[in-house]
Amino acid sequence: MGRARDAILDALENLTAEELKKFKLKLLSVPLREGYGRIPRGALLSMDAAALTDKLVSFYLETYGAELTANVLRDMGLQEMAGQLQAATHQ
């Protein structure tokens, strides 16, 4: 298990149920880097934080998965959490 994966999980586990739901919805439309696909909506909406972390890392690998997670958190107004996530992955 990598540092970035742990940091993603830590961030997602700190979201309220309502925020996690919003995170998933934003993930469905967040701008992606070229060459990356979108996690299918059906699979996404029922996932808990641990399953979502696994899916993010399998789809986007650790480095980009962490960056993408941080960007979605920023889109949600959670800049502090995004900064903590990125700081943890760059330690």
Epitope: P31, R74, D75, M76, G77
Partner: antibody
């Protein structure tokens, strides 16, 4: 188009407090603008869960609260001085990505004077 | 805090001119930059978000570009109604910060 409702003017004495209101939704920001100056972000509050963020510069003087039942955000500004005479805007972030301030109230002009 | 530096502070121009307004962030802010237009005695209005996304209803003569630390707002052919103050702002980190603004005036 969403309209953010703010009262127009407030006249307060030095050292006093004022509570500004804004009918809004989602994340509501408060922004200060002194005459002829730029924009300064005071802080924001999430109307659905009450989560707040403050600019440290304003943390001692500004308190952000929300009344969910009326979808109203408030900022209480305390121990006011002449430097606090400004227009105070509320703004919402409703665009799904990049967290811009896409809806702005008309602003409340606060004059601090004895 | 992230400092947003805007330049020039003011510009005098003629109708129909092409205008380039610049905004520099003191550190990498990705694409988390917005541009706002503010006319006298009015509240700011969102023009561009995410560095390059034109907001609903904004004329296509307004174009945003840039990423990381350097950002540009271009107005391809300035109209009389574009004479206003323009503010850039970042939403990458708290506290959210704005530039001091650029004033567009008529020559």
């Amino acid at each position: 188009q969403v309209q953010l409702q703010q009262p127009g003017t407030e006249l307060v004495k030095p050292g006093a407090s004022v509570k500004l209101s804004c009918r809004a939704s989602g994340w509501t920001h408060w922004v200060k603008q002194r005459p002829g100056q730029g924009l300064e972000w005071i802080g924001n509050i999430n109307l659905s869960n009450g989560r707040t963020n403050y600019n440290e510069k304003f943390r001692a003087m500004a308190t952000l609260t929300v009344d969910k039942s009326s979808s109203t955000a408030y900022t209480q500004l305390s121990s006011l001085t002449s430097e606090d005479s400004a227009v105070y805007y509320c703004a919402n972030s409703m665009v799904p990505h990049f967290f811009p301030m896409d809806y702005w109230g008309q602003g409340t002009s606060v004059t601090v004077s004895s | 805090n992230i400092v947003m530096t805007q330049y020039p502070k003011s510009m005098s121009l003629s109708i129909g001119e092409r205008v380039t307004l610049r905004c520099k962030a003191s550190e990498n802010v990705g694409s988390y930059v917005s541009w706002y237009q503010q006319k006298p005695e009015q509240s700011p209005k969102l023009l561009i978000y995410g560095a390059s996304n034109r907001y609903t209803g904004v004329p296509d003569r307004f174009t945003g570009s840039g990423s990381a630390t350097d950002f540009i707002l271009t107005i391809t052919s300035v109209q009389a109604e574009d004479l206003a103050d323009y503010h850039c702002g970042q939403s990458y980190n708290y506290p959210l910060t704005f530039g001091a603004g650029t004033k567009l005036e008529l020559k």
